[in-house]
């Protein structure tokens, strides 16, 4: 006899990266029919919703209106169909943004580069904080994680077409309260003369997932799409 | 900006009861979620009962079936009433709301709520 019901698929619109003081909406998708959702919050409970009717509602959704370094951290849901219970989701980490100060991002030997040179990123910032974390546009993100005591360097080494896009850094206090972000740095890769012309900055995704995050520093504005970064959801377990 | 302001709490007997009504000035109360939360003296801050917009509600183990929260809409009121008193109740009664929200989210966790009122204290003693 099933002991349990299956996992539950947590995820946060729009983005998992969240300024502070701007509003995010946790999903908690189950299934027809469960009675009862329970939010947790670094293990503990954090918030209840009972769907009406839950015959017609497989989907529920926990409103965060006001984001501070309290809320950043892992969460996680479950559902329940009578007195069954479902297995706990997958972790969602929750970060704040906009914490202290702004990086600065640079990239050497420069933006405009030939397919195959070395290239690195330097991303620098003078208050406390020894975790840096550069970001690309786009689904995939590339997110990676350096080291210094104001500086980490990126190095990505000999870079090909599918290096070209934007990138962002961030300084991190902790794994989920993070900086403002840096001005962006767009890479410009030429000298693959087969893919060059062909190639889009990235195939995976039309860069949506930085977009809606911008979107939320810059007005608030909710966006009804679950567009989160696996990448650096990874990154910070 | 969401002001609350309890009132309600005093001294009572073991197995008495008070009703804490937490007042809520400005026109958004009928999209918030209200929640109480108690701290006694040299303890953390604990929840105690929840309701949602929608009245769904949520109370700590502790309480049940001693403690019932409600709202009043048209008087921008969340009310809190105990019965069945005990020592350990004892504490500094606090309201809090959730603004804005959906209709169905009960918030338990002390770090989901955006407005605090000051405090009632109550006290259960022979």
């Known amino acids: 006899q099933q002991q349990t019901l299956p996992k539950p698929f947590i995820w946060a619109e729009p983005h998992f990266m969240v300024p502070k003081e701007k509003q995010v909406t946790i999903c908690c998708q189950g299934n027809y029919g469960a009675v009862e959702y329970q939010l947790h919050f670094e293990g503990s409970l954090f918030a209840v919703d009972r769907p009406k009717p839950p015959e017609r509602i497989n989907k529920v959704k926990f409103y965060i209106p006001d984001m501070n370094s309290r809320m950043a951290g892992q969460y996680s849901c479950i559902y329940r169909v009578g007195e069954l219970w479902s297995e706990p989701s997958n972790l969602l980490d929750l970060v704040v943004t906009e914490m202290y100060d702004t990086p600065t991002l640079s990239v050497h030997p420069g933006p405009e580069v030939i397919s195959g040179e070395k290239v690195t990123f330097y991303c620098r910032l003078d208050t406390a904080t020894s975790m840096f974390l550069l970001l690309k546009e786009g689904r995939s993100s590339h997110v990676q994680r350096g080291y210094g005591k104001v500086q980490a360097e990126f190095p990505l080494g000999p870079v090909t077409t599918a290096h070209r896009g934007t990138y962002r850094c961030f300084g991190s206090y902790n794994n989920h309260a993070w900086s403002f972000p840096s001005e962006p740095v767009k890479l410009l890769v030429t000298g693959d003369i087969e893919n060059t012309s062909l190639a889009p900055e990235d195939p995976t995704f039309p860069a949506d997932t930085w977009g809606t995050y911008l979107l939320t520093t810059e007005t608030g504005l909710q966006k009804d799409h679950a567009l989160w970064d696996h990448t650096a959801q990874n990154l910070l377990r | 900006e969401v002001q609350l302001v309890e009132s309600g709490g005093g001294e009572v007997q073991p197995g008495g009861s008070l009703r804490l009504s937490c007042a809520a000035s400005?026109?958004?109360?009928?999209?918030?979620?209200m929640g109480w939360f108690r701290q006694a003296p040299g303890k953390e801050r604990e929840f105690v009962a929840a309701i949602s917009r929608s009245d769904d509600t949520y109370y700590a183990e502790s309480v049940k079936g001693r403690f019932t929260i409600s709202r009043d809409n048209a008087k921008n009121t969340v009310y809190l009433q105990m019965s069945s008193l005990r020592a350990e109740d004892t504490a500094v009664y606090y309201c809090a709301a959730v603004v804005p929200t959906y209709g169905s989210n009960i918030y338990v966790h002390s770090a989901a709520y955006n407005y605090w009122g000051q405090g009632t204290l109550v006290t259960v003693r022979p």
């Open positions: 400005g026109r958004t109360f009928a999209s918030a979620a």
